[in-house]
């Protein structure tokens, strides 16, 4: 089963060449594990095969696969990578339809500095 | 409608370059994605590479890195396709492409020949 | 890169037959999976886009299937205009590719 409030390492295969090398479960599209988030995922990857913008495969790993830090914190990605990618990409997901999860809305996101991420604790996020 | 008018016909010599234009109408030229598609004769199809008309951003296959500039004049809503050091492999119908939903090719311009012989 | 390979690559039909041609990607493509015809001395004309997705005013004799590798164009009356070659093309990855033709005879 999947044990709640622990740093788990990354086995999604794209994710894997990323600056971090453990995540944690659910994200914040609420994904249980990393095979869902895999699957989830899979739609967003034309994206960056088409390559629309340079940060686009970091911004889906730390979305989908988030950094894991001091076991109980989720690191959500940085608001303003997420405006980077979302407007550099904006016209191929329009072309592909593909739906962008509210969840990662960026006006939902933090402003922070992407080397010393802004953490959130799933307790409150995802226990209420 | 949707228009995509290519130039005409071109006869050129090992060595040289080619440059093919193709004029689009009767939508946002700066919407869609732009691609070149070639068709060597008798064969099937092979993609070149495209761009955004709006910023210009162009991505191309690795065979003709190099060797393909593809550029635009959004005053015209015209988009070119420069191809160089051109050999006889290159004799092929080159079409330019609309990309449209699902990232297909909907509307393809009617074609040029490019015949390249000594 | 991508392969896709189209089979058959020639087929003999007759007018009202059903007619089915694959493509099979040598990855998983999920649904990205585009279907042209072509005419001799035309450009190709796109029939369905995403796998499924019947473009505009194409006849709904035309239908499209699959996900993943494997992929399926039906033609489910041949019309005497549809004599044709039909080619796939994957875009999920750089560098777009297509898929060999499948030309439709008159048998």
């Known amino acids: 089963g999947h044990s709640l409030f622990t740093c788990e390492p990354i086995t999604v295969p794209r994710c894997m060449k990323m600056a971090y090398n453990m995540t944690f479960f659910p994200n914040l599209m609420g994904h249980y594990d990393q095979s869902i988030a895999a699957v989830e995922m899979e739609h967003f990857l034309p994206l960056a095969n088409l390559e629309c913008s340079p940060n686009i495969e970091t911004f889906l790993c730390k979305a989908f696969v988030p950094t894991c830090i001091e076991q109980i914190h989720v690191v959500p990605p940085c608001r303003k990578l997420c405006e980077k990618v979302y407007s550099d990409c904006k016209k191929l997901i329009d072309t592909f339809g593909i739906r962008w999860p509210e969840e990662l809305e960026c006006d939902r996101l933090q402003y922070c500095d992407e080397t010393v991420p802004v953490t959130f604790d799933p307790h409150t996020e995802f226990l209420g | 409608q949707v228009q995509l008018v290519q130039s005409g016909a071109e006869v050129k010599k090992p060595g040289a370059s080619v440059k093919v234009s193709c004029k689009a109408s009767g939508y946002t030229f700066t919407n869609n994605f732009m691609h070149w598609v070639r068709q060597a004769p008798g064969q099937g199809l092979e993609w070149m590479g495209g761009?955004?008309?709006?910023?210009?951003?162009?991505i191309y296959a690795q065979k003709f890195q190099g060797r393909v500039t593809m550029t635009r004049d959004t005053s015209t809503s015209t988009v070119y396709m420069e191809l160089s050091s051109l050999r006889s492999e290159d004799t092929a119908v080159y079409y330019c492409?609309?990309?449209?939903?699902?990232?297909?090719?909907?509307?393809w311009g009617q074609g040029t020949l490019v015949t390249v012989s000594s | 890169d991508i392969q896709m390979t189209q089979s058959p690559s020639s087929l003999s039909a007759s007018v009202g037959d059903r007619v089915t041609i694959t493509c099979r990607a040598s990855q998983s493509i999920s649904s990205y999976l585009n279907w042209y015809q072509q005419k001799p001395g035309k450009a190709p004309k796109l029939l369905i886009y995403a796998a499924s997705s019947l473009q505009s005013g194409v006849p709904s004799r035309f239908s499209g299937s699959g996900s993943g590798t494997d992929f399926t164009l039906t033609i489910s009356s041949l019309q005497p205009e549809d004599f044709a070659t039909y080619y796939c093309q994957q875009s999920y990855s750089t560098p777009l590719t297509f898929g060999g033709g499948t030309k439709v005879e008159i048998k």
């Open positions: 761009f955004d008309p709006e910023d210009g951003e162009t």
């Open positions: 492409a609309r990309v449209g939903r699902g990232y297909s090719f909907d509307y």
